[in-house]
């Protein structure tokens, strides 16, 4: 029987009974937070062969092996992953081995096995036989291998039963437990699965099969399952569903997603039966099962019950995520916040139409309104007292409304009001009048020329770049020396730069008044010689990357109306030179005959330019005569140490430090100090662990149902 849509077993181990009739779990399986150690020996689910999403085990006391629970679990498809992982075993205090001796394939995703203080038999499993790429696996903080003394079946009797493979240059026996070998298919099967008797399965089988070369005898399907047969693609008039089976139109019409409203069920799109139209598509009518492309962002109408939606935090903005039409009024009042501009853009950046008015007041955290990056129409169906539909009052750091060169905004009805915005130049407001079609609507007091822009460099001159030079990780630029009316008023220059894959950035992108800024800033002092052009060397850049750069002059000069005069450049786009690419990833080689090797790899993570070709080199190696000869009968060779506590990176202090070759001199000395790169890597690793743990906790700790 198919079970799902995801099974969460927590608190009470007897809930495991829910798995009794499952052959396939269409979705995930969580077993977690069972704090009382129980006897799991009476629980066995031999029918379960496939999990279509992921398996997560977390804090299950008393469970020592998964082999008895799931003796026939063969495939974890990873159609949806838990933080990039298809198998997560985390903080399982009593788990001694994984023991999933029939697990043959994890189709997508990696594994994360962490902080399991008593867990052994990890180094004896060759994960490359189960996963395509092992580079993303994370196996950390478990019982140290040298404390485990893992023995594969028959090793003690010197009649080893398991096969050997090489991992990290170590050729060794592969097993799941002391009495279960890791199954390997004959090389003649290639990528195909095999039966218990080593006969090759049908190419459409995955994991295993009950009879050779028979597409109806598969334990799981490589591609799709339909009416008892494994098929490479779904037959006509059937549709892919949940990544593993084919269903007909009626089936798809008959199911609802947990998130959908009463009337909206699943849709059929691109040969798949799915919960919702994919990004960029919308249903062809409210009751339709089919998707059509959206023109521009897909419309989503959001309505505020109380007519006016107050945006005073990221949390309140979050409610508008994905909205394109907002029925009501927007009151924006952002006094403080972290990374506020990009957060607001994330949640409000798709709004195109506001049917009422927009009011921005006391929003001292805002530098620009560009976070409303798609706003094109304010209808003004409801207006503030005085017939205002756009009202901007007391925003101490607001410098830009929008980039009017790339913005069409219409205010259909109502007037604009601007007051007490000391960094907002009046010219910017007048430009908005022109663009929005409100010129002539405002009366004299609606745009205050005294208290708008009183503390800004509103009369800007243009700085011109004079030269640019690039290398793979450096840019040198120079610009004309700016000469304000009084030379003494020129203090310095500030250079702003950032990665810009596209030539569409503006000065205010990602900038807020609370310190967040997507631009890197460098101060450049004036050259002592008045005739030398100012310039800067930007270093530590990425190869073959386009950067946006602009320069501002920092001045003191006041001109008419006590407004500050300043200067800045246009935004310059400049690309660093190409460099050597990083190494290709996930290199795999396999032999498919006595005279051929098939080598596969993924592109480098940093191409550092346009890749034109790869060079593959190979050479014949002498047969490795070294065989594993450790005698487990002499137990004294296995260091006996304290029980592992499942923590990570605890360095043990020993009385006699190891002798290391350090800095070219032989002899006893301290361990070499860690390089900056190693320290950075450790820091990133610790950060990554924290992020994962937070994700885990946030995902699984939920309020009790009412």
């Amino acid at each position: 029987e198919i079970c799902g849509p995801g099974i969460d077993i927590r608190n009470d181990y007897q809930q495991l009974k829910r798995l009794e009739n499952c052959t396939v779990i269409e979705g995930y399986l969580h077993i977690l937070l069972i704090s009382k150690a129980e006897d799991y020996r009476s629980y066995r689910f031999p029918k379960l062969t496939v999990i279509t999403e992921y398996l997560l085990l977390f804090r299950v006391a008393g469970l020592e092996s998964l082999g008895d629970l799931f003796p026939n679990l063969t495939v974890i498809r990873g159609w949806k992953l838990f933080y990039n992982y298809a198998l997560v075993i985390f903080e399982m205090t009593n788990l001694k081995d994984i023991g999933l001796y029939n697990l043959r394939n994890i189709t997508r995703g990696a594994i994360r096995i962490e902080k399991n203080a008593d867990l052994c038999y990890l180094s004896t499993v060759d994960w490359s036989l189960i996963l395509d790429a092992v580079s993303n696996n994370y196996i950390v903080g478990n019982k140290p291998p040298k404390e485990c003394g893992d023995l594969c079946p028959g090793t003690m009797e010197e009649k080893p039963m398991c096969e050997k493979t090489t991992i990290n240059n170590e050729y060794n026996y592969r097993c799941w437990t002391t009495n279960r070998c890791q199954k390997m298919c004959p090389s003649t099967c290639g990528k195909r699965a095999c039966t218990e008797n080593n006969e090759c399965c049908h190419p459409e089988c995955l994991g295993s099969c009950s009879a050779p070369d028979n597409d109806t005898a598969c334990v799981a399907c490589r591609h799709y399952y339909y009416a008892g047969v494994c098929v490479p693609a779904c037959p006509p008039n059937t549709y892919r569903f949940e990544g593993w089976r084919c269903v007909d139109r009626d089936f798809c019409a008959n199911i609802l997603s947990a998130e959908s409203s009463d009337s909206e069920g699943f849709v059929i799109h691109d040969g798949e039966c799915m919960q919702e139209c994919p990004s960029g598509f919308i249903r062809n009518g409210s009751q339709s099962m089919y998707c059509i492309p959206c023109e521009g962002p897909c419309p989503k109408v959001c309505e505020e019950e109380k007519k006016t939606k107050t945006i005073d935090s990221v949390t309140s903005a979050q409610m508008l995520q994905g909205c394109t039409i907002f029925k009501g009024n927007l009151l924006i009042n952002i006094r403080r916040g972290n990374n506020i501009a990009s957060e607001l853009e994330n949640f409000m950046g798709l709004i195109e139409v506001v049917t009422g008015y927009v009011k921005i007041r006391h929003s001292h955290a805002l530098v620009s309104l560009s976070f409303l990056k798609n706003l094109r129409l304010i209808l003004g169906e409801e207006q503030l007292e005085g017939n205002y539909s756009f009202y901007v009052l007391d925003n101490q750091n607001l410098q830009q409304l929008w980039d009017w060169d790339h913005r069409n905004l219409t205010i259909k009805a109502g007037k604009m009001y601007f007051a007490f915005n000391p960094k907002l130049c009046v010219s910017e407001i007048y430009r908005m009048e022109e663009v929005t079609g409100t010129k002539g609507r405002q009366s004299k007091g609606d745009i205050n020329t005294r208290n708008n822009g009183e503390r800004a460099s509103c009369e800007s001159d243009v700085l011109h770049f004079t030269s640019t030079t690039t290398s793979k990780n450096r840019i040198i630029i120079t610009w004309h020396r700016y000469r304000p009316p009084d030379y003494r008023d020129l203090i310095s220059f500030t250079v702003y730069y950032k990665e810009a894959p596209f030539k569409n950035v503006t000065e205010y992108d990602g900038q807020d008044a609370c310190g967040s800024n997507s631009w890197n800033m460098v101060d450049v002092d004036l050259p002592p010689n008045k005739d030398v052009e100012p310039g800067i060397l930007l270093h530590g850049l990425k190869p073959w990357t386009q950067y946006a750069v602009y320069v501002k002059a920092v001045t003191l000069t006041m001109v008419e109306n006590d407004h500050i005069r300043g200067a800045k450049s246009e935004i310059l786009y400049i690309r660093t030179n190409a460099s050597v690419p990083s190494i290709p990833l996930d290199v795999l080689s396999a032999s498919n005959s006595s005279s051929q090797l098939i080598v596969k790899w993924n592109p480098p993570s940093l191409p550092n330019g346009n890749l034109s070709y790869y060079i593959v080199r190979w050479q014949r190696q002498p047969q490795d005569g070294y065989l594993y000869r450790h005698n487990y009968c002499s137990k004294d060779k296995i260091p006996i140490r304290k029980y592992a506590d499942g923590t990570i990176d605890i360095e043990e202090v020993t009385e006699n430090p190891k002798t290391e070759v350090c800095g070219g001199e032989k002899g006893p000395c301290c361990a070499c100090p860690k390089t900056e790169a190693e320290k950075q890597a450790e820091k990133e690793e610790a950060e990554y662990r924290k992020v994962f743990e937070n994700f885990l906790h946030n995902s699984i700790f939920v309020p009790r149902p009412e």
Epitope: P5, A227, T238, V247, D250, F251, N254, I255, L256, S257
Partner: antibody, heavy 123, light 112 residues
Framework: EVQLQQSGPELVKPGASVRISCKAS????????MNWVKQSHGKSLEWVAN????????NYNQKFKDKATLTVDKSSNTAYMELRSLTSEDTAVYYC????????????????WGTGTTVTVSS | DVLMTQTPLSLPVSLGDHASISCRSS???????????LEWYLQKPGQSPKLLIY???NRFSGVPDRFSGSGSGTDFTLKISRVEAEDLGVYYC?????????FGGGTKLEIK
């Protein structure tokens, strides 16, 4: 075309048993429960029971627990209902109707009905 | 068992008239997940029943938009905005929320 073809009319004696069939075509048989519904002459409809073709799991209306037994034959995409210890009260038209087999959320309706089998119990 | 009570038993109408049929359940048929499995079926003389409305108010594909369903909790209504000759027959409400699933007694829509 999706169809549920039911077996022909049955005339049976009181106390006897009868097995009626419902052959599915045009869809994946194992994706839907098979339900059976009774309609006595001039009366309303009564849900009898349903069966999961994958594993033979059944749900019965307690009223029919001792009267009806449901089975399936996956190889021929056919569902069966056996009625035993028949009395005149069992004289009715019996319909099969499919209902999606999906553990998540479903619209849960009988979207396809069989043609109906008339069972007459008479001595 | 959940008893489904339909009123009226018979509904004589003229073609083009509006028609309304009521169905009341003896207890709430709202499931714990918030879904209400209330359907309406039409059975024409000598035919099998056919699905019209599912989950209170959703029209099944191919059902004309003159049919509409409404209600919540225990009270439900089927409305036909302009009755046509092909609409004549017996209408049944059905609850699929609690086992045993139950049908209403039926309402016969006939010409005056």
């Amino acid at each position: 075309e999706v169809q549920l073809q039911q077996s022909g009319p049955e005339l049976v004696k009181p106390g006897a048993s009868v097995r009626i069939s419902c052959k599915a075509s045009g869809y994946a048989f194992t994706d839907y429960y098979m339900n059976w519904v009774k309609q006595s002459h001039g009366k309303s409809l009564e849900w009898v029971a349903n069966i999961n073709p994958n594993n033979g799991g059944t749900n019965y209306n307690q009223k029919f627990k001792d009267k009806a037994t449901l089975t399936v034959d996956k190889s021929s995409n056919t569902a069966y209902m056996e009625l035993r210890s028949l009395t005149s009260e069992d004289t009715a038209v019996y319909y099969c109707a499919r209902w999606i087999l999906y553990y998540g959320r479903s619209k849960w309706y009988f979207d396809v009905w069989g043609t109906g089998t008339t069972v007459t119990v008479s001595s | 068992d959940v008893l489904m009570t339909q009123t009226p038993l018979s509904l004589p109408v003229s073609l083009g008239d509006h028609a309304s049929i009521s169905c009341r359940s003896s207890q709430s048929i709202v499931q714990s997940n918030g879904d209400t499995y209330l359907e309406w079926y039409l059975q024409k003389p000598g035919q099998s029943p056919k699905l019209l409305i599912y989950r209170i108010s959703n029209r099944f594909s191919g059902v004309p938009d003159r049919f509409s369903g409404s209600g919540s909790g225990t009270d439900f209504t089927l409305k036909i905005s302009r009755v046509e000759a092909e609409d004549l027959g017996v209408y049944y409400c059905f609850q699929g929320s609690h086992v045993p699933y139950t049908f209403g007694g039926g309402t016969k829509l006939e010409i005056k």
